[in-house]
Amino acid sequence: EQAPGTAPCSRGSSWSADLDKCMDCASCRARPHSDFCLGCAAAPPAPFRLLWP
């Protein structure tokens, strides 16, 4: 349970101070210095790929 007044971001997202909204942490792979990436706890897993066609 979140404390009152905390940022309402779901798992895998983080609050952007500049945009004043939650942003998807997956985008930090491409732009790691975006402000909200500071709040992304761990690197998101690499996208799943089939090893055969």
């Epitope: 905390t6 983080s14 101070a17 790691p32 500071l38 709040g39």
Partner: antibody, heavy 120, light 103 residues
Framework: QVQLVQSGGGLVKPGGSLRLSCAAS????????MSWVRQAPGKGLEWVSA????????YYADSVKGRFTISRDNPKNTLYLQMNSLRAEDTAVYYC?????????????WGQGTLVTVSS | LTQSPGTLSLSPGERATLSCRAS?????LTWYQQKPGQAPRLLIY???SRATGIPNRFSGSGSGTDFTLTITRLEPEDFAVYYC?????????FGGGTKVEIK
């Protein structure tokens, strides 16, 4: 209990290097961003650098960019600040702090501080 | 971030009103208290939410570029330096501080 214990300060000559450490305990270290903040004698607080929980995103104040490097060793629950090309104006008490993203990036747990003196 | 006044001289029991002004619009602001020889202590996050263990005589308000920290009735332990802090453009920034001293 939640704790940050700092080490590594001391006296260094201008142009020299120093590494500060901050050992975390009592919380899941990887879940939190961390930051370094400094305070020159008799002056206010100045943010130095911050790093995300994974270590994949780093941020620096303009005054230290290119000279200081923030890093973390998550298995060891330890935060570092490597300081190179030190100047007299880097003399300060350095604090490590835990950053709460869900607190809109407020810092809720602080180390005890370590004094770095840059002087010849 | 510009804090005013630089020093506030008040007596215990009085109300303290501290100002923090940003040069550009800020979405949320944080306040800290620092006593001599101690590390800062988180007071208010997200402009108006009290951190754990902070008494309700401390309150934060404001929006845009103007923010306020109010201490309704000063206790002896409240005499300290107070800093505001923002996070903008991937930079954390502190105000210069306001010292609340005993009159």
């Amino acid at each position: 209990q939640v704790q940050l214990v700092q080490s590594g300060g001391g006296l260094v000559k201008p142009g020299g290097s120093l590494r500060l450490s901050c050992a975390a305990s009592g919380f899941t270290f990887t879940s939190y961003a961390m930051s370094w903040v400094r305070q020159a004698p008799g002056k206010g607080l100045e943010w130095v650098s911050a790093i995300s929980g994974s270590g994949g995103s780093t941020y620096y104040a303009d005054s230290v960019k290119g000279r200081f490097t923030i890093s973390r060793d998550n298995p060891k629950n330890t935060l570092y600040l490597q300081m190179n090309s030190l100047r007299a104006e880097d003399t300060a008490v350095y604090y490590c702090a835990r950053v709460r993203a869900n607190y809109y990036y407020g810092m809720d747990v602080w180390g005890q501080g370590t004094l770095v003196t840059v002087s010849s | 971030l510009t804090q005013s006044p630089g020093t506030l001289s008040l007596s215990p029991g009085e109300r303290a009103t501290l100002s923090c002004r940003a040069s550009q619009s800020v979405s949320r602001l944080t306040w800290y208290q620092q006593k001599p020889g101690q590390a800062p202590r988180l007071l208010i996050y997200g402009t108006s939410s009290r951190a754990t263990g902070i008494p309700n005589r401390f309150s934060g308000s404001g929006s845009g570029t103007d923010f306020t920290l109010t201490i309704t009735r000063l206790e002896p332990e409240d005499f300290a330096v107070y800093y505001c802090q923002q996070f903008r453009n991937s930079l954390l920034t502190f105000g210069g501080g306001t010292k609340v001293e005993i009159k």
